[in-house]
């Protein structure tokens, strides 16, 4: 049956046993800045092009054992959530991956900046259709990272990022705090904010909306047909990147402001239990869970 | 995220150094009275001291960025410091990434075209 997360973002009219928008996102290219990925996984084979971009720090620890499957874990799962054949949101979207996170999931602001610059240069050299950039990472507040995101957004690129998994104000983290970026928090099957041990999804006024981010089934790098469940605001951001790809594929001329407005408009309202958030953050945190547009756009989204 | 709201630095550390220009025997001194600022991550464990993003003013050309980077290297060498330019930015933001001692920050902040300098820091998969 359909995974809970795909059911949650699907308009009621399309909730059959399968989630199947066959051509979702086909006009859009989604850039993923993350770990390395297993591009020959059945979920994403032929859908993800691995660029030659790599800018990562050395792994911590003297006895670190590098295993390809572990190095690829995070990125492979997210690529699957965005465009996977069976468990993806925008099954028609093509993706390009840049490696900015090492085998331990760690990167640098500078490496991310160089990655964003690489995307901008690629866009200038070979202009294509709409671009979505998925940044499933977070660090402390960074003026320069936010500035780079702002410049890329002003060049017409849609940036989607994870709010962060620190159970904290997203405004203290980057790129989550960049105003031009679509910042996504995570909710679970009960529409509760996701708890990750003592930590959990970030919140506050720098979050634009929430999306499914707990127990998300997606491609596992353990084998080319394996699946695994992962949780986090990265998974939530991947859902919104997929939804954005589908919206932009249906309406390629959408501006960032219009896309943001549509994401908010079609979101489920006031379903999140706000008691989970600190009292002073409840009024600032948007009570919105991302969803695809309903049947009024049937011809556009489900061709 | 969340457009239409004022930007907030939170605990973000900003060390503002208002510095007069020091010509150091080279042309292109900064305009009188300009202030370049230094920024670093508020979370100490995520800081990566020794690597800095030098961000130049918006309309700075690539050739000026390269010249500013070379100038920093020359001035640092005169003081006995080794520096390494790791990347020159253009296309999104003008500037360069430099590996150098934190002792050189005051010098770097006085360079022409410099808007601000940010110490590198870690980001993590979420």
């Amino acid at each position: 049956s359909i995974p809970w997360n795909l059911e949650r973002i699907t308009p009621p009219r399309y909730r059959a046993d399968e989630y199947q928008p066959p051509d979702g996102g086909s006009l859009v290219e989604v850039y993923l800045l993350d770990t390395s990925i297993q591009s020959d996984h059945r979920e994403i084979e032929g859908r993800v092009m691995v660029t030659d971009f790599e800018n990562v720090p050395e792994e911590d620890g003297t006895r670190f054992h590098r295993q390809a499957s572990k190095c690829d874990s995070h990125g492979t799962h997210l690529a699957g959530v965005v465009s996977g054949r069976d468990a993806g949101v925008a099954k028609g979207a093509s993706m390009r991956s840049l490696r900015v996170l090492n085998c331990q999931g760690k990167g640098t602001v500078s490496g991310t900046l160089i990655g964003l610059e690489f995307i901008r240069k690629s866009q200038l050299v070979q202009p294509v259709g709409p671009l979505v950039v998925l940044l499933p990472l977070a660090g402390g507040y960074s003026r320069v990272l936010n500035a780079a995101c702002q410049r890329l957004a002003r060049a017409g690129v849609v940036l989607v990022t994870a709010a962060g998994n620190f159970r904290d104000d997203a405004c203290l983290y980057s790129p989550a705090s960049a105003p031009e970026v679509i910042t996504v928090g995570a909710t679970n099957a009960q529409d509760q904010p996701v708890t990750l041990g003592t930590l959990g999804t970030n919140f506050g006024r720098c979050v634009d909306l929430f999306a499914p981010g707990e127990d998300i089934i997606g491609a596992s790098s353990d084998c080319s047909t394996c699946f695994v469940s992962q949780s986090g605001t990265s998974q939530a951001a991947a859902h919104v990147a997929g939804i954005a790809a589908m919206m932009l594929s249906a309406e390629p001329e959408l501006t960032l402001a219009e896309l943001r407005q549509r994401l908010i408009h079609f979101s489920a309202k006031d379903v999140i239990n706000e008691a989970w958030f600190p009292e002073d953050q409840r009024v600032l945190t948007p009570n919105l869970v991302a969803a695809l547009p309903p049947s009024t756009h049937e011809n556009l989204y489900f061709q | 995220g969340a457009m239409g709201q004022e930007d907030e630095d939170g605990d973000y550390e900003e060390l503002v150094l208002a510095l007069r220009s020091e010509e150091d025997g080279l042309a292109e001194a900064p305009e009188h009275g300009t202030t370049a600022t230094f920024h670093r991550c508020a979370k100490d464990p995520w800081r990566l001291p020794g690597t800095y993003v030098v961000v130049l003013k918006e309309e700075t050309h690539l050739s000026q960025s390269e010249r500013t980077a070379r100038r920093l290297q020359a001035q640092a060498a005169r003081r006995g410091y080794l520096t390494k330019i790791l990347h020159v930015f253009h296309g999104l933001l003008p500037g360069f990434l430099v590996k150098m001692s934190g002792d050189l920050l005051e010098l770097a902040l006085k360079l022409p075209h410099v808007d601000y300098i940010e110490e590198d820091s870690s980001v993590f998969a979420q």
């Epitope: 792994e59 911590d60 620890g61 003297t62 006895r63 670190f64 054992h65 590098r66 295993q67 572990k70 874990s73 085998c103 331990q104 999931g105 760690k106 998994n165 620190f166 990750l196 041990g197 003592t198 930590l199 949780s231 | 979370k43 100490d44 464990p45 800081r47 993590f124 998969a125």
Partner: antibody
Framework: QVQLVESGGGVVQPGRSLRLSCAAS????????MHWVRQAPGKGLEWVAL????????YYADSVKGRFTISRDNSKNTLYLQMNSLRAEDTAVYYC???????????????WGQGTTVTVSS | QSVLTQPPSVSAAPGQKVTISCSGS????????VSWYQQLPGTAPKLLIY???KRPSGIPDRFSGSKSGTSATLGITGLQTGDEADYYC???????????FGTGTRVTVL
């Protein structure tokens, strides 16, 4: 609910070996780093070892390096501590504890077991 | 011997405030996140504070944490008899590549 239960403690002679286990339940074990911490009778807490969520990295206190091995089986939701060449000074209550998160292992420990007692005596 | 130093004991009357210091160096407190743990007599330790000043859910706001340079401080206001326990600071030490605990402080409610 979230729970850690240690087992395998007991009385052992110096120079011998012992293997401690820690059974985790109520959370996604494979998403968290795990620590062993010990406390000698009447003394303070002493960190022993840490293993990353996927087992790819291990760290040890100098006092146990080369003698103790931390490992985990994510399919069984179990953490282990293999203790070889035991000494009298290894006598303590051994706690397993969950790291606050996988990537931010230096954040500390948020869930603790009740401990298992190891006595090294001839 | 612990690389983080705490006072052996502090005491105050019910309702009063106590502070516990934890002194380290740049390789631990200076550049790493500090946590505080409470150990009630005969029980396992419990996390009180992480990331210098954040409280896990369920920990009352009577407990607070702060950091300055290479020292950290735990504050307990409105002291209650149930707060009688041993308190430990803890942090990662980058030069040791390991976690370190403070020497521990016993809090007595007079």
């Amino acid at each position: 609910q979230v729970q850690l239960v240690e087992s395998g403690g007991g009385v052992v002679q110096p120079g011998r070996s012992l293997r401690l286990s820690c059974a985790a339940s109520g959370f996604t074990f494979s998403s968290f780093g795990m620590h062993w911490v010990r406390q000698a009778p009447g003394k303070g807490l002493e960190w022993v070892a840490l293993i990353w969520n996927d087992g790819s990295n291990k760290y040890y206190a100098d006092s146990v390096k080369g003698r103790f091995t931390i490992s985990r089986d994510n399919s069984k939701n179990t953490l282990y501590l293999q203790m070889n060449s035991l000494r009298a000074e290894d006598t303590a209550v051994y706690y397993c504890a969950r790291a606050i998160a996988a990537l931010y292992y230096y954040y500390g420990m948020d869930v603790w077991g009740q401990g298992t007692t190891v006595t090294v005596s001839s | 011997q612990s690389v983080l130093t705490q006072p052996p004991s502090v005491s105050a009357a019910p309702g009063q405030k106590v502070t516990i210091s934890c002194s380290g160096s740049s390789s631990n407190i200076g550049n790493n996140f500090v946590s505080w743990y409470q150990q009630l007599p005969g029980t396992a330790p419990k996390l009180l504070i992480y990331d210098y000043n954040k409280r896990p859910s369920g920990i009352p706001d009577r407990f607070s944490g702060s950091k300055s340079g290479t020292s950290a401080t735990l504050g307990i206001t409105g002291l209650q008899t149930g707060d009688e326990a041993d308190y430990y600071c803890g942090t990662w030490d980058s030069s040791l590549s390991g976690y370190v605990f403070g020497t521990g402080t016993r809090v007595t409610v007079l």
